[in-house]
């Protein structure tokens, strides 16, 4: 008995087509994505095969206008008009708080939504009963396949679920799941979840029964042969795992952005053991025409979000690169121009002794969620700025112990390589890290702008010494693992909006050139 | 302030037809679905039909279904009900309603009504 | 559909008093349960959506509870202002509206 699944992952608000780097869509013949192109593939499948899935593994939530404007309902739309047969919750569903989950999108999604490692206690838990489920149990032609699903046990630190979820262990939840769908005689079973690839492999390792592992969260892109696009594949598609009872296990995952879509194909026998599977991403590029029902239902919500916020605000002259593959690894120019705005918004001249009372800005890299491209005539609006910082966060004002600074930037890059959010850009602040040390021990240089001076320069941190700091309030309560910073800051002053701050330097800029310049560098 | 006005109510005999209309201010109208619930002389309320934002969601309680036809223009921000094979037990004040959260394809509960306009059918 | 049972249908009592009145679901609504208040001649008032959160500009007298099948109205106080005909409503996802038969509040 064979099964298509067709799965997407962290999708992000990318209702529209988009640019090849997942930003706005400037040149309409190059683009690609998009739900309409996406229901123009999904639906060629379905009338070719007969036994078909599509599955999304978490994360539709935040990264456009789409979500700033619409907080969800525009997710529960679309996938009920593609037809989605189940989704998993990522940690991102939680960024409006449940309430933000629950109304827009478990009351009115016509698919299961999924995730048994999720526990709801006191008052939410008979709120939320039902709503999502751990597992679900899907007739496909004429079998059954299980789908369990499973979120980030992370995700307290990275969203906003509140004090009335719980996040268990993946493994340690989805066993008792699974053994729960063995007994009601479910032979093909399906983990559907979002916590990354590292943890989806753990789970086929480790889960006893589970077949087949759909995953997001790390964006990971796998492939078998030549790859279609810029994506780099991270291993071949699917990616095989032997689990500890001897049993050969596919792992997929779909990069990001709605860019691709995963197919795989699963052959089984009558007792539900896989036999083969195989496949590969299929990239949605303009050679697939946007189905036009589907199209013509986003320009009527477009309409919405073009009122909402198309004035230019000022230019940029040169690529504003907000790209994870730059900003999670290395200085990119997207965060050195936020840094600076973020400076710039906190210029308060106090007296003759400092020529500012702050200088320094940290930002995790993680945050930055996309890039702008100046070839559309260098136009720079809110709705641009939304995609680039779609959190609705504001730029705060901390005292740290240089110690603390140092600690974070050695957290900055403790796993470094594996595309995390806690990669810090900065501003008014060198480092200079040696990732041949051990992680705690990277940080080889550490200079700091001067405040108390005429004329600024870069002076060592001192460990003792207490500094002030602009930063996200991501990052000041925590987030992304930045434990010390919420746990040492010394002080805390709540600022204003994010995409205000960048906005009104943009504004006040006129035109921006931002460069990579040697902020952070590697010996 | 929010303000929902119905009007075309009036005396109809039985098996004729009759147009409801809404006029809604106050709030923006396009981003909520609207509503139609009635009530009989001395009865309780009944939900007629809804109408979701982008009206790709339109519901009809099983007593009018085939015979109401609800539908809205956000241009003029109104909200109409064709009433069709109308019938004495159709004999009722007819509320417009506003649903409560935005943006919502299912329905949710009513915020803000109007004053309700009389529908009497009777030969 | 889902059918919605208010009782009582009549209550009597006095200004002052702590009154409950309650309404069962045919099949689990979750907490997609709203409560109005109706006076002669007028339309129905909203004062509790999703089973217990309070329309603003309604008076903290007035709570809702309950989740699943069974809900309550409370009104801790009774006011002149209140006698009324009470009525809920289920708005579960998908399903047709459906509001409870209502309950009188009078004066005792």
């Known amino acids: 008995w064979e099964l298509t699944i067709l799965h997407t992952n962290d999708v992000h608000s990318r209702l529209e087509q988009t640019s090849e780097d997942s930003s706005k869509c400037v040149n309409a013949s190059r683009c690609m994505g998009g739900v309409a192109r996406l229901f123009t593939k999904v639906q060629q499948i379905r009338r070719a095969e007969p036994n078909v899935l599509l599955l999304d593994a978490g994360d539709q939530y935040q990264g456009t206008i789409w979500f700033t404007v619409y907080k969800g309902a525009e997710v529960a739309h679309f996938m009920n008009a593609l037809r989605y047969d189940a989704m998993a919750l990522g940690n991102h569903e939680f960024d409006n708080g449940v309430e933000g989950l629950i109304e827009p999108l478990l009351k009115e999604a016509k698919f299961p939504i999924l995730s048994a490692n999720i526990k709801a206690k006191g008052p939410l838990a008979s709120q939320i009963s039902g709503l999502y489920l751990p597992y679900k149990v899907l007739p496909v032609g004429d079998e059954v396949v299980g789908i369990v699903g499973y979120t980030s046990k992370e995700t307290p630190f990275l969203s906003n679920p509140g004090t009335n979820l719980v996040f268990e262990d993946e493994i340690t939840a989805l066993q008792p799941e699974v053994d729960k769908l063995k007994t009601l005689n479910v032979n093909k079973i399906i983990a559907l979840g979002h916590s990354g690839f590292e943890t989806d492999k753990l789970i086929a390792q480790k889960v006893r029964g589970v077949d087949v592992v759909v995953g997001g969260h790390s964006n990971t892109f796998l492939y078998t042969g030549n790859p279609p696009s810029k994506e780099v594949p991270a291993g071949k598609y699917p990616f095989i795992v032997t689990s500890d009872d001897g049993r050969k296990v596919p792992v997929v995952q779909a990069y990001a952005f709605g860019k691709y879509l995963g197919y795989l194909k699963i052959e089984f026998d009558e007792r539900g053991n896989v036999i083969s599977s195989h496949g590969n991403p299929i990239l949605l590029n303009s050679s697939i025409p946007e189905d036009p029902s589907i199209k013509a239902d986003i320009n009527k919500w477009r309409i919405k979000l073009d009122n909402y916020s198309t004035q230019e605000l000022g230019k940029t002259i040169v690529y504003l690169d907000g790209s994870s593959q730059s900003c999670r690894f290395r200085e990119c120019n997207m965060g050195n121009l936020i840094c600076d705005a973020m400076i710039n918004n906190n210029l308060r001249h106090a007296d003759e002794m400092f020529w500012n009372h702050v200088s320094m800005c940290i930002l995790n890299g993680g945050g930055i969620r996309s890039p702008i491209d100046e070839r559309n005539n260098g136009t720079i609006t809110w709705e641009n700025l939304a995609a680039v910082l779609p959190f609705g966060g504001t730029f705060d004002l901390v005292q740290l112990k240089g110690s603390t600074l140092k600690k974070a930037f050695e957290h900055s890059v403790h796993r470094y390589g594996q595309s995390t959010g806690e990669f810090l850009q900065v501003g008014g602040i060198h480092v200079v890290y040696d990732l041949s040390r051990k992680p705690g021990d990277r940080v080889v240089k550490l200079d700091v702008l001067c405040t108390k001076c005429r004329v600024p320069s870069y002076d060592p941190l001192k460990m003792d010494e207490i500094y002030k700091v602009i930063l996200p309030n991501f990052l000041a309560n925590g987030g992304d693992g930045f434990q010390m910073i919420k746990d040492e800051l010394l002080r805390h002053d709540s600022g204003d909006q994010d995409i205000n701050v960048v906005s009104t330097y943009i504004s006040k800029m006129k035109v921006i050139y931002p460069a990579v310049e040697g902020r952070i560098k590697f010996s | 302030e929010v303000q929902l006005v119905e009007s075309g109510g009036g005396l109809v005999q039985p098996g004729r037809s009759l147009r409801l209309s809404c006029a809604a201010s106050?709030?923006?109208?396009?981003?909520?679905?609207m509503h139609w619930v009635r009530q009989a002389p001395g009865k309780g309320l009944e939900w007629v039909s809804g109408i979701s934002w982008h009206s790709d969601n339109i519901g009809y309680a099983d007593s009018v279904k085939g015979r109401f036809t609800i539908s809205r223009d956000n241009a003029k921000n109104s909200l109409y009900l064709q009433m069709n094979s109308l019938r004495a037990e159709d004999t009722a004040f007819y509320y417009c309603?506003?649903?409560?959260?935005?943006?919502?394809?299912?329905?949710?509960?009513?915020?803000?009504w109007g004053q309700g306009t009389l529908v009497t059918v009777s030969s | 559909d889902i059918q919605m049972t208010q009782s009582p249908s009549t209550l009597s009592a006095s200004v002052g008093d702590r009154v409950t009145i309650t309404c069962r679901a045919s099949q689990s609504i979750s907490n997609w349960l709203a409560w109005y208040q109706q006076k002669p001649g007028k339309a129905p008032k909203l004062l509790i959506y999703?089973?217990?959160s309070l329309e603003s500009g309604v008076p903290s007298r007035f709570s809702g509870s309950g989740s699943g099948t069974e809900f309550t109205l409370t009104i801790s106080s009774l006011q002149p202002d209140d006698f009324a005909t009470y009525y809920c409503?289920?708005?579960?996802?998908?399903?047709?509206?459906?509001f409870g038969q209502g309950t009188r509040l009078e004066i005792k």
């Open positions: 309603a506003k649903d409560g959260p935005r943006y919502r394809g299912s329905y949710y509960y009513f915020d803000y």
């Open positions: 999703k089973a217990s």
């Open positions: 106050g709030f923006s109208f396009d981003d909520y679905a």
């Open positions: 409503q289920q708005y579960n996802s998908y399903s047709p509206i459906t």
